[in-house]
């Protein structure tokens, strides 16, 4: 079976305050079994942005139908961006278990927030 890669294509994304940000993430293999989660930041202080198995996450929607069995696109859209949303976002694959354990992370996408156009 193919080795899992997590493709976060964009190193950085810039969005105006009030707009939506699309953060791209694609995986290359369905194995190992387990959910995808998105975090802002790294380490112990990281903030959970989206979990495929939990919710709701009111400002976050998935770009494609993540409940499809063979879906490999886990890109998300975050609505009504504010300066507090700035940071580096990581798409992370977890291996199913009790509890789920982190398996592999994408390279990260830095979100910067521009002032709202007047």
């Amino acid at each position: 079976e193919e080795e899992l890669q997590i493709i976060q294509p964009d190193k950085s994304v810039s969005v105006a305050a009030g707009e939506s940000a699309i953060l791209h993430c694609t995986i290359t293999s369905l194995f190992p079994v387990g959910p995808i989660q998105w975090f802002r930041g790294a380490g112990p202080a990281r903030v959970l942005i989206y979990n495929q198995r939990q919710g709701p996450f009111p400002r976050v929607t998935t770009v494609s139908e993540t409940t499809k069995r063979e879906n490999m696109d886990f890109s998300i859209s975050i609505s009504n961006i504010t300066p507090a949303d700035a940071g580096t976002y990581y798409c992370i694959k977890f291996r199913k278990g009790s509890p789920d354990t982190e398996f592999k992370s994408g390279a990260g996408t830095e979100l910067s927030v521009r002032a709202k156009p007047s």
């Epitope: 890669q5 976060q8 294509p9 964009d10 190193k11 994408g106 390279a107 996408t109």
Partner: antibody, heavy 119, light 103 residues
Framework: DVQLVESGGGVVRPGESLRLSCEAS????????MTWVRQAPGEGLEWVST????????YYADSVKGRFTISRDNSKNSLYLQMNSLRADDTAIYYC????????????WGLGTLVTVSS | ALTQPASVSANLGGTVEITCSGG????YGWYQQKSPGSAPVTLI????NRPSNIPSRFSGSTSGSTTTLTITGVQAEDEAVYYC?????????FGAGTTLTVL
């Protein structure tokens, strides 16, 4: 074997239109994003446009936005590029490329079709 | 934009590295074109993946903002133009190309 065969190129005058086609075989066409890439004489490769697997999302280079339209017919395993308001700087070989799982990576290419815009 | 050298040379049987840097991409690919107007061939996609029809002497690696195509045991038929490609559309996807001359 994956095969991509482009057609529809030719010589047109500035301002005229042309429609390119790409017939795909050897893979499940409906599952993959598809892309047009062009190469002007003596120049490098230039991304033109990409369309999603279902055909509901399209992406364009700034140089062709508003003039070119990408489309596909999954029932016919075919990709299209409608080119309007053609300019001399659109002269190039146009390649059809199959996108890998992330759509800006290409794993197979066609042989290309030449478009010449000249008065 | 993606930046790569305009030209490099290598001895027959030797090893050559072609680098590409810059842009807004986390991941890269490499494409070979043997003559102007001929169909490009994908050598590497998503940093390190090699299509099954590509010889193992071609390999790719990425570190930070720089990706490298390495050809080990250069053959005469490797003389070509090599384009790097980025994963982010903001890059325009392709570098300007590097011409490899085999000595």
């Amino acid at each position: 074997d994956v095969q991509l065969v482009e057609s529809g190129g030719g010589v047109v005058r500035p301002g005229e239109s042309l429609r390119l086609s790409c017939e795909a075989s050897g893979f499940t066409f409906r599952n993959y994003y598809m892309t047009w890439v062009r190469q002007a004489p003596g120049e490098g490769l230039e991304w033109v446009s990409t369309i999603s697997d279902t055909g509901d999302t399209a992406y364009y280079a700034d140089s062709v936005k508003g003039r070119f339209t990408i489309s596909r017919d999954n029932s016919k395993n075919s990709l299209y590029l409608q080119m309007n308001s053609l300019r001399a700087d659109d002269t190039a070989i146009y390649y059809c490329a199959k996108s890998w799982i992330w759509w800006t990576f290409f794993d197979y290419w066609g042989l290309g079709t030449l478009v010449t815009v000249s008065s | 934009a993606l930046t790569q050298p305009a030209s490099v040379s290598a001895n027959l049987g030797g090893t050559v590295e072609i680098t590409c840097s810059g842009g807004n991409s986390n991941h890269y690919g490499w494409y070979q074109q043997k003559s102007p107007g001929s169909a490009p061939v994908t050598l590497i996609y998503a940093d390190t993946n090699r299509p099954s029809n590509i010889p193992s002497r071609f390999s790719g690696s990425t570190s930070g903002s720089t990706t490298t195509l390495t050809i080990t045991g250069v053959q005469a038929e490797d003389e070509a133009v090599y384009y790097c490609g980025g994963s982010s559309t903001g890059d325009g996807i392709f570098g300007a190309g590097t011409t490899l001359t085999v000595l």
